[in-house]
Structures are given as C-alpha cells and as structure tokens.
C-alpha cells in the first residue's frame, strides 16, 4: 500500500490576465471514488481557503458558482485555474487532498506553488 | 471569534440512548469538518467520530461504530452526535473539535459530561 | 490502524529545562502529526500541527520535528504554564488515533 502524496510545481507565474494554472497530482493508496480538492493560500503563515471542490472519479470538478476557480481531473491528476488574480494575491497556494470514499478517509498536502502575479502597466493615454 | 459549546450530557442507564449537540459560531461551518472525541475519568483522549462538510461522509472509531451517529445541521451551524445501547465505558467527557484548515483540531468546546451507570 | 505510543509516559522537569517527547507511528503517517497540551479539567489546546508548524498564539518555545513514523514535541525553557499532559495525533487517515499522553509535572 503506497502512502497518499501530493506533487504540484514549486513556481507558476500568472498571465497577464491574471490566470494562474497548475496541476496537482495525488498518489492514492487505495481506490477512491470521491475526492475533494481544496485550493489554500499561505500568506505570513496565514492560511486561507481559496476554493474547494469534490468530485467522483471520472467526473469533472464543480466548484461553487462564484469561485475564482475551475479545474478538471484525469485519473489521479487534477488541472486547476484561478482567475482574477492580482499583484497583492501573490503567494503560496497550497493544494489538499482528500480521499472521502470509500474508507479509510486520507489527507494529503502539497508544498505549495508560489504564484507570482504582475499588474500589468496601464496603457498609456495617447494624444489623439 | 471562533466558539463551540456542547450540551446534551448527563446520566443515563446502561442500554439506553442519549443525544450531544455541539452549537458552533464565528467560522463558516460548512467549510469544516467536525469531530468528537471524548476522555473517559483519569484517562487519556479518545477519537470518536468525524464528519465531514457537507455531511454525507462520517468516520468512527470502532469502539462506538454501530452504536453512535455523527450529523450535522449547515444551516442551523450545529454538529450532533447521537448515542445508543449506551455502555459503562462510554462514560466520559465528550468534546466537539473543528478540524483544522490543514490537519489539526485547532478549536475545542469545554466539554460535556456523560455518565452510564445504573 | 494506525497505533500511536508516546514516550515517556511521564516525566519531571523543572522550569527552565529543555524537555523533549517523542511520538511514534504504527505505520508511516507523513508529517500528518498534531501536537496538543491539556490541563486537569480543560479542554486540549493544539500546539503543533503537520508536525512542525506552530499554531497561531502557541508560544516559540514549542517546537515540533519530525517525518514517516517518528516525531518529537521539544519545549526549550520549561515555564510554569508548561505543566500539563501532552498528546499526540496522526491525522493522515481514519481512525485519527491519539497517542497515550505523556504527563510533564514539576521536580
């Protein structure tokens, strides 16, 4: 039985639209059929929850409706987004994993992927 | 600030049932899951119970699996954990604990006392 | 399951001593491991939790360490406050055990 382990990147920098993607991946030690994936952010050891998620193997991620987060699973490979983001949401973001189904339930954690986020410059006013 | 108080304890007779509940505050309860663990007279602590968000997965120590039913209430921000065929060696202070963000049970209520004995 | 044991069950120390606890594993739990202090008639307060990271408001003087099977909960400089029994918890997969407790009273 192989121990629960979470990868994702050490490093990721945001588009200039403020998107930031990564994946997460898990080393299961059992079959799960249920799985949530929560998204937390560390900033000056605090942590925070970004979005949360779970689905059933197999089956495409729903996150609530106002979440600045979208993703999509692939066995054990989970491809998340996060939208809107800004200079000051540069930070750890952290990716938790949960076998929920069947038991035993599991916990994995990642080591964050430090997300760099640019304002970008304004445009500047031309003379016409 | 984050608070949670049990109520629900007292004595009851070996075999019967007895029902805890757990009023949480200051935190989105959804977004938690929720424990119980209980600390019999002079001894160490013991896992009860889990529940997790939306409710639909629970996970028990296998001293109470069979006999005890962890629930949970979102909207009424309330955690339950119902008690049946109620044994001597389930007396005990019963805390209701939130897990932590990341692992951890970062918040616990002062605790209720139930006692069997007949 | 997974079975935890603490050692020792009990130790004396006076203030200013460095003390340490160890904890062990059944089996490998990660840094999955929670460190927690209770006094006689309170509820337990969560020190450490993954292992090493300090929760918010626990003194600098608690530290945690270790990975796998085999963690220690480490007080620097005994104080008065510090007098109390100590758990451990793995929390990497259901049942969530605690270990037995180890009981830091005064020399």
């Known amino acids: 039985c192989k121990a629960m382990h979470v990868a994702q990147p050490a490093v990721v920098l945001a588009s200039s639209r403020g998107i930031a993607s990564f994946v997460c991946e898990y080393a299961s030690p059992g079959k799960a059929t249920e799985v949530r994936v929560t998204v937390l952010r560390q900033a000056d050891s605090q942590v925070t929850e970004v979005c949360a998620a779970t689905y059933m193997m197999g089956n495409e991620l729903t996150f609530l409706d106002d979440s600045i987060c979208t993703g999509t699973s692939s066995g054990n490979q989970v491809n998340l987004t996060i939208q809107g983001l800004r200079a000051m949401d540069t930070g750890l973001y952290i990716c938790k994993v949960e076998l929920m189904y069947p038991p035993p339930y599991y916990l994995g954690i990642g080591n964050g992927t430090q997300i760099y986020v640019i304002d970008p410059e304004p445009c500047p006013d031309s003379d016409f | 600030q984050v608070q949670l108080v049990e109520s629900g304890g007292g004595v009851v007779q070996p075999g019967r049932s007895l029902r805890l509940s757990c009023a949480a505050s200051g935190f989105t309860f959804s977004r938690y899951g929720m424990h119980w663990v209980r600390q019999a007279p002079g001894k160490g602590l013991e896992w009860v119970a889990v529940i997790w968000y939306d409710g639909n997965n629970k996970y028990y120590a296998d001293s109470v699996k069979g006999r005890f039913t962890i629930s949970r209430d979102n909207s009424k921000n309330t955690l339950n954990l119902q008690m049946n065929s109620l044994r001597a060696e389930d007396t005990a202070v019963y805390y209701c604990a939130r897990a932590g963000i990341l692992t951890g049970l970062d918040y616990w209520g002062q605790g209720t006392l139930v006692t069997v004995s007949s | 399951d997974i079975q935890m044991t603490q050692s020792p069950s009990s130790l004396s120390a006076s203030v200013g001593d460095r003390v340490t606890i160890t904890c062990r594993a059944s089996?490998?739990?990660?840094?999955?491991l929670n460190w927690y202090q209770q006094k006689p008639g309170k509820a337990p307060k969560l020190l450490i939790y993954?292992?090493?990271s300090l929760q918010s408001g626990v003194p600098s003087r608690f530290s945690g360490s270790g990975s796998g099977t085999d963690f220690t909960l480490t007080i620097s400089s005994l104080q008065p406050e510090d007098f109390a029994t100590y758990y451990c918890?793995?929390?990497?997969?259901?049942?969530?055990?605690f270990g037995p407790g180890t009981k830091v009273d005064i020399k």
């Open positions: 089996q490998s739990i990660s840094s999955y």
């Open positions: 993954a292992a090493s």
């Open positions: 918890q793995q929390s990497y997969s259901t049942p969530f055990t």
